[in-house]
């Protein structure tokens, strides 16, 4: 059962795995619900009861029955990982405490204008975990204004004490608001010869780099397939760093892989989520329970339904036996891996699917798309929304893309005579106007949040957010697309698509159904000499063919250019402006996503 | 109707600098660009450059880009071309023009020209 | 920068006869080439753009053809009132820029 709520002076007895030390009882809640085996959390705050050397300590809990004694205890906050609850989880943690100084490795100091500019400077250092900042108030003259960078094995404080006129806080990486380049690549025939922080048992070398990512102290990887010749190493993912932050050394080894970190695209593809099944394979682990299952799809259920289970491994029926139901085998580990992988028995294994709502809930796959033709199919473009006005009768005024469960993102310029936020209705997991009937349900828009630099489409910083007053429950017809990864601003999109309901040629009239239209992206300086009197910034991207033809058209303002990069759909662009519908050679114009993702998540995150 | 009037012909010393008006009626003047376009006696058709005037963006031809300066007045609906540091090539007439689109293309009313001789 | 370059510089041709225009790009230029018509001491005139299409007002015996970078204008029978300077422009790249013009002239 999911249990939000803070329990005060109360402290769970036992159970304990290990103690961090964290700045408070809701970060606790948070390493707890990322640690592998965390269900419960106790913390002692400051308080002139408690033992100084106490406080700020978080005692990382495990019970089999889910549950331990409570005992009161002043100054203790205990609670429940957020693991049995079926909501988004964020390890994203933008708060700053002041007075508190973290503990860690000081491996850069320098002088910072301001707390922000630290934590700033933090988030786009690749060793960076957390940081200490000194204020101009700080009584020692030569520490005033310094920013300490940190770091430790646990990506949390070694120890956390009370210290006047300093602030400290984290690396904002877990919120995708990292400069740091985000390299998707995975080498083969690759090993990369630095010191290993740790190592772990996985499956292929997609999990290998899934878990270098989550772990705190992993740059890059190195995995051995099970074809690599040395067979105590089979499936042995070799988690590593370095000084520099780069692999110093790349030796060439058939059957071997290596890769990088994805913290800095983690907003954009799934890190936690290890979906796939592995046949003829077996994952070894302390074994939790021994359920009948008819398939290894309900194996991964059960396992993903009991809040322990970390991976399984199920075996078929022999034949007319047990009502052809086979084995289920429900495990855990103590780092989440399996303890060893084994081939060639007729097993299939997999992981919980529990870690997945820890991604973002744009990252998770979507059916597949229908190849050709113009009209789109029902749940095709699961976070394409028609924006309606009813001022002065009703109409489909804009396309829009959701983004959160609260969030629409389009452009500025739908906005132009919108006196009022009551006069608009959202409609998602549409495919024809036609569906759109007196009682259909839409969420209605609570507030307008249109960029304060935007004069006109043409000028740029034509994006617009609406928040809706009601959230979005996600199905298969209506889900969010990722927003592009800073770090991913070098990546060349090939798969890129331009949706909406508009016109598909000048003075034509809406389209009733979703209409899609593939387009490739033009480069802004060939884009630039097709548009002489107006300029292209990087803060627009350029798509359409060179023969025209397919455009997007008036009435498709707003909407997504999605394109699709390593199997998740990002919103690269919104429809902005450009020259009539798919006029040969003029491409589309529209706003470049990436250049305003940190505008989206201070509009969208803020308190 | 649509109508471009340009000023009158000038003549102008080498080394100094002369500025062309061009007064737009008969459309809304910030929806379409503004290009400027000149005629050597006797050559043919050089591009100098381009106005945006709802946006006051200008992109200028590389012969020109050091020399020319292109600028508008919207209360009045006139664009203005302005080229510095004369010499006696740059005799031409010089014509305005508005794009037939709103983003670029054909040139579809053009101004009757000014005639700029550069003579010591 | 793209070059224009037409072809002939000069052409006579009798009254009701068809005059025809050479244009070739040094690239493609896809559609976005216009013809104009200039008459001695006035502005060039906008005949034809997008290659094909006639403007506004402009007699049905003058036509556009062509495709990537050979357009061609055609009088499909030649008036008094032809006599001009004809002149290609493409559109497709910045800077804009014009062939050298073809007179045309009554035989």
């Known amino acids: 059962e999911c249990v939000t709520q803070l329990l005060k002076d109360t402290c769970f007895e036992g159970g304990d795995i290990t103690t961090v030390f964290t700045p408070s009882a809701k970060y606790c809640q948070v390493v707890c619900t990322y640690h592998p085996r965390c269900l419960l959390f106790t913390f002692t705050a400051e308080s002139p009861s408690e033992d100084p050397t106490r406080w700020f300590t978080c005692v990382l809990k495990d019970s089999v029955t889910e549950t331990l004694p409570r005992v009161n205890r002043t100054a203790a906050i205990s609670g429940y990982s957020f693991k049995q609850c079926s909501h988004q989880i964020s390890a994203c943690n933008k708060d700053i405490y002041v007075d508190l100084d973290m503990k860690g490795i000081n491996y850069n100091s320098s002088v910072a204008k301001s707390a922000q500019e630290c934590q700033e400077r933090c988030t786009d250092d690749v060793h960076c975990h957390f940081f200490t900042y000194a204020t101009r108030q700080f009584p020692s003259l030569e520490h005033r204004n310094i920013c300490l960078l940190k770091h430790t094995q646990t990506g949390t404080p070694t120890r956390i004490t009370k210290l006047d006129k300093v602030v400290s806080g984290f690396s904002l990486k877990s919120c995708a608001l990292s400069n740091l380049a985000c390299i998707r690549d995975i080498f083969p025939n690759t090993v990369f010869a630095d010191s290993n922080i740790d190592s772990v048992m996985a499956p292929d070398a997609f999990v290998c780099g899934r878990i270098c990512t989550h772990h705190p102290g992993c740059l890059f990887f190195t995995f051995f397939s099970q074809e690599w010749p040395k067979e105590s190493q089979r499936n042995l993912c070799l988690l590593k760093t370095s000084e520099s932050g780069l692999p110093s050394t790349r030796i060439k080894k058939s059957k071997a892989l290596s890769g990088f970190s994805l913290q800095s695209c983690r907003h954009s593809i799934p890190v936690f989520c290890h979906s796939s099944f592995y046949h003829d394979t077996d994952f070894l682990g302390e074994e939790l329970d021994i359920v009948a299952a008819k398939s290894h799809e309900a194996c991964q259920k059960l396992c993903t339904n009991a809040v322990r289970c970390q991976f399984f491994t199920y075996t078929p029926a022999q034949a007319s036996c047990n009502e052809g139901k086979g084995k289920c085998y429900l495990k855990l580990s103590s780092n989440g891996s399996p303890t060893k992988i084994l081939h060639g028995r007729g097993g299939i294994s997999g992981y919980t699917l529990r870690l997945c709502k820890m991604d973002n809930e744009c990252t998770t796959k979507i059916k597949p798309r229908i190849v050709g033709g113009t009209a789109s199919v029902r749940g095709e473009w699961p976070w394409q929304v028609t924006l309606h006005t009813t001022s002065p009768t009703q109409r489909h005024l804009c396309g829009g893309s959701i983004i959160g469960n609260q969030w629409i993102l389009t452009a500025a310029h739908c906005f132009y005579g919108v006196e009022s936020p009551k006069i608009l209705r959202v409609y998602s997991g549409i495919l024809n106007q036609s569906e759109i009937k007196e009682d259909t349900s839409f969420f209605g828009v609570q507030e307008i949040i249109i960029h304060d630099q935007y004069k006109m489409a043409e000028s740029g910083y034509d994006i617009a957010l609406l928040k809706l007053e009601t959230t979005v429950n996600y199905t298969d017809s209506q889900r969010p697309i990722c927003l592009p990864s800073k770090g991913d601003r070098n990546v060349i999109y090939t798969d890129c698509w331009v949706t909406g309901w508009g016109y598909r040629k000048l003075r034509d009239k809406i389209q009733n159904t979703l209409q899609k239209a593939k387009i490739p992206l033009v480069t802004n300086e060939e884009c630039q000499k097709r548009y002489r009197g107006h300029k292209i910034t990087h803060k627009m991207i350029c798509a359409g063919y060179r023969e025209g033809g397919k455009d997007a058209c008036k009435g498709d303002s707003g909407g997504p250019l999605s394109c699709k990069h390593n199997e998740v759909w990002h919103l690269v662009g919104i429809t902005s402006w450009g020259e009539g519908c798919a006029q040969r050679e003029r491409p589309g114009v529209y706003t470049n996503v990436v250049e305003y993702v940190d505008w989206i998540l201070e509009k969208t995150q803020a308190v | 109707q649509v109508q471009l009037v340009q000023s009158g012909a000038e003549v102008k010393k080498p080394g100094a600098s002369v500025k062309v008006s061009c007064k737009a009626s008969?459309?809304?003047?910030?929806?379409?660009?503004i290009e400027w376009v000149r005629q050597a006696p006797g050559q043919g058709l050089e591009w100098m450059g381009v106005i945006n005037p709802g946006s006051g963006y200008t992109n200028y031809n590389e012969n020109f880009k050091d020399r020319v300066t292109m600028t508008r007045d919207t209360s009045i609906s006139t664009a203005y071309m302005e080229l510095s540091r004369l010499r006696s090539d740059d005799t031409a007439v010089y014509y305005c023009a508005r794009t037939y689109g709103k983003y670029g293309g054909a040139m579809d009313f053009w101004g009757q020209g000014t005639t700029v001789t550069v003579s010591s | 920068d793209i070059v224009m370059t037409q072809s002939p510089d000069s052409l006579a041709v009798s009254l009701g006869e068809r005059a025809t225009i050479n244009c070739k790009a040094s690239?493609?230029?896809?559609?976005?080439v216009a013809w104009y018509q200039q008459k001695p001491g006035q502005p060039p005139k906008l005949l034809i753009y997008?290659?094909?299409n006639r403007y506004t007002g402009v007699p049905d015996r003058f036509s556009g053809s062509g495709s990537g970078t050979d357009f061609t204008l055609t009088i499909s029978s030649l008036q008094a009132e032809d006599v001009a300077v004809y002149y290609c422009q493409q559109d497709y790249s910045s800077p804009p820029t014009f062939g050298g013009g073809t007179k045309l002239e009554i035989k």
């Open positions: 008969g459309y809304t003047f910030t929806n379409y660009l």
């Open positions: 690239q493609s230029v896809s559609n976005d």
């Open positions: 997008y290659i094909s």
